[in-house]
């Protein structure tokens, strides 16, 4: 049964251009066996499929090798256009970034997208945040109700490309001062000014109170 299959296939192989590099070929099915080191490729055209023997695999396929058996296997990595092997992509579909043989819609943490090559490259690597610094204002740690505290982190590794920005390496936040009044009674000019204004306001308030009391008793006496 199979012997008949092989002989009939060999018959028409010299004249047919799709039989290039074939050891067994037919007009209907193309190549069924390839010369050593060539890759068997199953080309599909609608419902028809026929074999070809190629020196290298077309785009979207990679060379799958077993001892003396080479074949073009379809790239099956998600969102991959061309690959080197079963699990290593070399070119991603439009809109995806290539990173370590895989395709991502966003680069993983620590990596930045390089738009010109659509690859994820090592981004700017920063260290851990320091502890928050002392709460201060105008370089003083007392004399105010509110101040600012700051923390920093170091750049551990500069990015591969200058166009890749580093994340912030210093940040500040509002904080409540532990000592509103400075030791030794010394107050800042601003604080003194505030106190004087308060005193003045209290004196005026007291004077107004006294004035209204005076008016009331005066009316009562009339």
């Amino acid at each position: 049964q199979g012997n008949r299959w092989r002989r009939s296939k060999r018959a028409s192989y010299v004249s047919n251009p799709i039989c290039k590099g074939c050891l067994s070929c037919s007009k209907d099915n193309g190549c069924s066996r390839c010369q050593q080191k060539l890759f068997f490729f199953l080309r599909r055209e609608g419902m028809r499929q026929y074999g070809e023997c190629l020196h290298s695999c077309p785009s979207g396929y990679y060379g799958h090798r077993a001892p003396d058996m080479n074949r073009c296997a379809r790239c099956r990595i998600e969102n991959c256009d061309s690959c080197f092997s079963k699990d290593f992509c070399t070119k991603c579909k439009v809109g995806f970034y290539l990173h370590r043989g895989r395709c991502f819609d966003e680069c993983p943490d620590g990596f930045a997208p390089l738009e010109e090559t659509m690859e994820c490259v090592e981004g700017c690597e920063v260290g851990h945040w320091s502890e928050w610094g002392t709460c201060s204002r105008n370089n003083r740690t007392c004399g105010f109700k509110w101040g600012l505290e700051t923390r920093t982190r170091q750049i551990v590794k500069k990015p591969v490309k200058d166009t890749i920005l580093c994340p912030t390496i210093a940040e500040s936040r509002r904080c409540k001062m532990t000592m509103r009044h400075c030791p030794g009674g010394k107050r800042t000019p601003k604080a003194k000014e505030k106190r004087n204004k308060k005193k003045k306001r209290k004196l005026i308030e007291r004077a107004q109170e006294q004035h209204s009391v005076f008016l009331a008793t005066d009316r009562a006496n009339q």
């Epitope: 012997n3 190549c31 066996r33 499929q49 379809r74």
Partner: antibody, heavy 119, light 107 residues
Framework: EVQLQESGPSLVKPSQTLSLTCSVT????????WSWIRKFPGNKLEFMGY???????YYIPSLKSRVSITRDTSKNQYYLQLNSVTTEDTATYYC?????????????WGQGTLVTVSS | DIKMTQSPSSMYASLGERVTITCKAS??????LSWFQQKPGKSPKTLIY???RLIDGVPSRFSGSGSGQDYSLTINSLEYEDMGIYYC?????????FGAGTRLEIK
């Protein structure tokens, strides 16, 4: 017509080596791929490996450490050696051939030989 | 390894009936699938290769179809000589692997 014929002992003791021969007529073993397949008592078929036209071999990972396929082109025969057998290796062993991805796989089979592993 | 899940594991069918056996691969096998028939005491016989190509001498009532992970073998009008065990085989990737088989018996 291509014909394959297995031969070898039908009984092997545990821990010993199972050795089988496949004699080929109607085709040369210097063309195509020559394999061994076994069928376990529960009807499960297992491809074991092959030797190619150039003498290169492929073995399935689960048997790699104890299987060997060799050939003698002058006799147009190829061989299977399976070391350290256990009762789990009791099966019908077939030799079969194919000629590449575009053709039928295992178009020709031997009639099979039942090998029992028992003490 | 690629696992081939074949169903049903056994079935009874009447003569003249249309019979379908299916095989599901654990991953896309790109049409690299064959079907075999084995009768008691005989070695397996190839029926179909590359999903739908019929071997010379195999009756035209046998046909194969499928793509990706799902494949099927159809016997259009069952005949008595069709009873036996049917196996699928994937050869997309080494090690090539067989389905567990479908035992087809006549009602």
């Amino acid at each position: 017509e291509v014909q394959l014929q297995e031969s070898g002992p039908s009984l092997v003791k545990p821990s010993q080596t199972l050795s089988l021969t496949c004699s080929v007529t109607g085709d040369s073993i210097t063309s195509g791929y020559w394999s061994w397949i076994r069928k376990f008592p529960g009807n499960k078929l297992e491809f074991m490996g092959y030797i190619s036209f150039s003498g290169k071999t492929y073995y399935i990972p689960s048997l790699k450490s104890r299987v060997s396929i060799t050939r003698d082109t002058s006799k147009n025969q190829y061989y299977l050696q399976l070391n350290s057998v256990t009762t789990e290796d009791t099966a019908t062993y077939y030799c079969a051939t194919y000629h590449g991805y575009g053709g039928p796989w295992f178009a020709y089979w031997g009639q099979g030989t039942l090998v029992t592993v028992s003490s | 390894d690629i696992k081939m899940t074949q169903s049903p594991s056994s079935m009874y069918a009447s003569l003249g009936e249309r019979v379908t056996i299916t095989c599901k691969a654990s991953q896309d096998i790109d049409s690299y699938l064959s079907w075999f028939q084995q009768k008691p005491g005989k070695s397996p016989k190839t029926l179909i290769y590359l999903t739908n190509r019929l071997i010379d001498g195999v009756p035209s009532r046998f046909s194969g179809s499928g793509s990706g992970q799902d494949y099927s073998l159809t016997i259009n009008s069952l005949e008595y000589e069709d009873m036996g065990i049917y196996y699928c085989l994937q050869y997309d990737e080494f090690p090539v692997t067989f389905g567990a088989g479908t035992r087809l018996e006549i009602k």
